[in-house]
Amino acid sequence: AAPCPDACCPHGSSGLRCTRDGALDSLHHLPGAENLTELYIENQQHLQHLELRDLRGLGELRNLTIVKSGLRFVAPDAFHFTPRLSRLNLSFNALESLSWKTVQGLSLQELVLSGNPLHCSCALRWLQRWEEEGLGGVPEQKLQCHGQGPLAHMPNASCGVPTLKVQVPNASVDVGDDVLLRCQVEGRGLEQAGWILTELEQSATVMKSGGLPSLGLTLANVTSDLNRKNVTCWAENDVGRAEVSVQVNVSFPASVQLHTAVEMHHWCIPFSVDGQPAPSLRWLFNGSVLNETSFIFTEFLEPAANETVRHGCLRLNQPTHVNNGNYTLLAANPFGQASASIMAAFMDNPFEFNPEDPIPVSFSPVDTNSTSGDPVEKKDETPFGVSVAVG
């Protein structure tokens, strides 16, 4: 094949090589950019900056090599449009530093930076960590800082990410209140800070105030939905990023719902309880306190991480006619109490009924939780018919 006279020439089915001396000063408008998986650039002294716009449209890029060129600066967001990048070789350029943000979000198997006049500072603490942890092939490069010795020997005691403290109100927060949160940021070289409020949705009206080093956040007219929602303060410096999440507990009274009994492996009287703080529960059977046993007990489903409502069952293992009756669930917290009742009829007397026999009741309780484990069974007979009346 005839030699390629262009600044950049195809290499394989989805590669591009740009090696003609001084032909590039940016990477705009590379031919066939959208399908490129490999880009090799060499001897480009005028290519000094690599920025976000340079790699736009290179979404399939996996290998990027820029060597023996004039690269002095790589923007922190330079690789935003190349999320599949796995090999990055920037050796023998003029780089003094490279931000941790540049490689954040990439899954780099290889990062080559040898032959650059690196300047040892806290901004390279992340790279020193890669070297310590054996990541990206960095240890094999024995990276040096220009006139300062090995990167591995750089003192790092003062190189920490920002320290965050979020102050939340001590006092009880009620529905409708306004809540002021303050995030105190400490650390060297603070660059940016802010709040992440994606979970809040309709839980409150949000107003931000202040700036580094003290950020304020007012949550106005809070609702009970604010419970279990993360409010996150973040801050960044040249070493890295820190985040602290807090939750605001909004007090509200207990509430309870009961549903018709259902037969599964066992019988279940489904319930839902809500309230903040979490309510204590008690069951009554025909008006008397129900003592929980391995045959009748409260079982909670796994709670959703971001809500206060708890769902569960009063679980009955092989109930008989003596378990027919009125079940009441009482829920109480310091802000109120609630109850709900339901009639359950599991079966007629399977043992022959004598009107003079006493009907026993099981009595006294505790709030409980969990998931199944009956013996694997073979049934010779079908169960008795059941009827359930809603009270």
């Epitope: 006493p358 026993p360 013996p375 169960p383």
Partner: antibody
């Protein structure tokens, strides 16, 4: 499948406290099952001692209630039995099992009360 | 009363049917479970609830209940069925469990 294993001293002095532990493997003690202790004096029948749920609910045999404590340690996936003020009548093979059906049992451990 | 009563001993000819009974007031209210115990071994659950057999238990074992009596029936007894059999159920109060005194089954 679930397996249970009792452990503890085989000899306890009269008036002392019998302490046994049941390690649960092949399943979580925090499942929807209760866990129980049963004993069997030599040559005699089975006697239910008590049961516990991982959230702390417990029930005891009324005849032993004043002397029995059953507890659960979720972090170790085990539950325990303490029986105080023992006498020779408490000499028995002690079993742990899964309630309510007692569908899984430990192999049992003989505890002798003797000075 | 919080008692379950069993016959101390029962015998059956090989291949014949035998019924082991358990009596008590609690059985008017609750199902019995049945356990088989061979010398030096832990008991094994054979029937629970309303005639449920755990997996691995042969179908010659079955349970039934009437009035204050629960029964374990072995249809076509085998030599390996020779063992002690215990019933248990919830006590009448529902708050604790009780065992019968056990029945020694001999297969002739």
């Amino acid at each position: 499948e679930v397996q249970l294993q009792e452990s503890g001293p085989g000899l306890v002095k009269p008036s002392g406290t019998l302490s046994l532990t049941c390690a649960v493997s092949g399943g979580s003690i925090s499942s929807s099952n209760w866990w129980t202790w049963v004993r069997q004096p030599p040559g005699k029948g089975l006697e239910w001692i008590g049961e516990i749920y991982h959230r702390g609910n417990r029930n005891y045999n009324p005849s032993l209630k004043s002397r029995v404590t059953i507890s659960v340690d979720k972090s170790k996936n085990q539950f325990s039995l303490k029986l105080s003020s023992v006498t020779a009548a408490d000499t028995a093979v002690y079993y742990c099992a899964r309630a309510p059906w007692f569908d899984y049992w430990g192999q049992g451990t003989l505890v002798t009360v003797s000075s | 009363s919080s008692e379950l009563t069993q016959d101390p001993a029962v015998s059956v000819a090989l291949g014949q049917t035998v019924r082991i009974t358990c009596q008590g007031d609690a059985l008017r209210s609750y199902y019995a479970s049945w356990y088989q115990q061979k010398p030096g071994q832990a008991p094994v659950l054979v029937i629970y609830g309303k005639n449920n057999r755990p997996s691995g238990i042969p179908d010659r074992f079955s349970g039934s209940s009437s009035g204050n009596t629960a029964s374990l029936t072995i249809t076509g007894a085998q030599a390996e069925d020779e063992a002690d059999y215990y019933c248990n159920s919830q006590a009448s109060s529902g708050n604790h469990l009780i065992f019968g005194g056990g029945t020694k089954l001999t297969v002739l």
